[in-house]
């Protein structure tokens, strides 16, 4: 039985050109963590931690994805394109899969202000 | 292209043993989570190990736990199947299957070898 | 363990044809379902993963949809080489389990 629930950095906004952390936090569960999945809103895969071979950034994104911290992922230079949904998937034995949703906002003002809360989607 | 070939299947009396054994080639297999997967004469489907790309966790479901076990070596490209303590219902054709890197679903499967246990 | 139901054993449709399978989960199984063809000579291949991802070199007549505890596979022109049989997948919870299986025929 599935136990598990992931915590996520939920709605945030962040300002063009500066740098974000996409956070996915699994909890209430023992389960063993085989990978975590790092998504955007296109479906296209960010990044992969994998619990033996380590990190692995795609190469379409090596540039502005650095890994960390911990499970999380970190998105440099943002751009107005980078709005939308990011997706963390986590993969675990014995409960199975867990999936997790932040969205992200890119704001064009340089007043805007970087905001984060922990909410369980 | 990636081409996993299945050797191994025989026929086998109830309690005995057999080994599979999936050969790998057309891709980094070190870097992959494998699995086997087996199709009964009734043509369903059930999965029945998968180990991850290093080999440090292997997962059963219930119905082989504890009488199969799955393994790997990576030098060789050569993925394992050792079966013991064999059942009427353990006839199938045993699928080797790799894994896409996102773990979504299983994207290349062998050919499959027939194994059949009777007395 | 998740029961995965293919109610359709097996159907028969002409080519040209549009042609939809369905597959229904005991539980939400929150889009992680997968689908495969097996043709008549046991040759297995991925279709479609997480519910509506077309795997690569995948023609794009097949597509995928649903949600929670009900999906569908279609094949929008049935074409000669589609005579197969599908099997769904859950990757939701272990043990992973597929559905019993929809032979396609000519009709």
């Known amino acids: 039985m599935m136990t598990g629930t992931i915590e996520t950095t939920g709605n945030i906004s962040a300002k063009k050109g500066g740098s974000v952390i996409l956070q996915c936090h699994l909890s209430s569960t023992m389960a063993q963590v085989t990978q975590v999945n790092w998504e955007q809103h296109d479906h296209s895969l960010l990044a992969i931690r994998n619990a033996e071979l380590g990190w692995h950034i795609y190469p379409a994104f090596k540039d502005r994805v650095a890994p960390g911290p911990g499970l999380g992922l970190t998105l440099q230079s943002l751009t107005m394109n980078d709005t939308g949904e990011y997706f963390c998937t986590y993969h675990t034995y014995p409960d199975g899969t867990y999936r997790g949703r932040i969205f992200l906002e890119v704001l064009e003002s340089s007043v805007a202000e970087h905001s984060a809360r922990f909410q369980i989607p | 292209e990636v081409q996993l070939v299945e050797s191994g299947g025989v026929l086998v009396k109830p309690g005995g043993s057999l080994k599979l054994s999936c050969a790998a080639s057309g891709f980094t297999f070190s870097n992959y989570v494998m699995s086997w997967v087996r199709q009964t004469p009734e043509k369903r489907l059930e999965w029945v190990a998968t180990?991850?790309?290093?080999?440090?966790?292997?997962y059963y479901p219930d119905s082989v736990k504890g009488r199969f076990t799955i393994s790997r070596d990576n030098a060789k490209n050569i993925l394992y199947l050792q079966m013991s303590s064999l059942r009427s219902e353990d006839t199938a054709l045993y699928y080797c299957?790799?894994?896409?890197?996102?773990?979504?679903?299983?994207?290349?499967w062998g050919q499959g070898t027939s194994v059949t246990v009777s007395s | 363990d998740i029961q995965m139901t293919q109610t359709t054993s097996s159907l028969s449709a002409s080519l040209g044809d549009r042609v939809t399978i369905t597959c229904r989960a005991s539980?939400?199984?929150?889009?992680?379902l997968n689908w495969y063809q097996q043709k008549p000579d046991g040759t297995v291949k991925l279709l479609i993963y997480?519910?509506?991802r077309l795997h690569s070199g995948v023609p794009s007549r097949f597509s995928g949809s649903g949600s929670g505890t009900d999906y569908s596979l279609t094949i929008s022109n049935l074409e000669q080489e589609d005579i197969a049989t599908y099997f769904c997948q859950q990757g939701k919870t272990y043990p992973y389990t597929f559905g019993g299986g929809t032979k396609v025929e000519i009709k």
């Open positions: 539980q939400d199984i929150s889009n992680f």
């Open positions: 997480y519910t509506s």
């Open positions: 299957t790799r894994w896409l890197l996102s773990l979504y679903a299983m994207d290349y």
């Open positions: 180990i991850t790309s290093g080999g440090t966790y292997t």
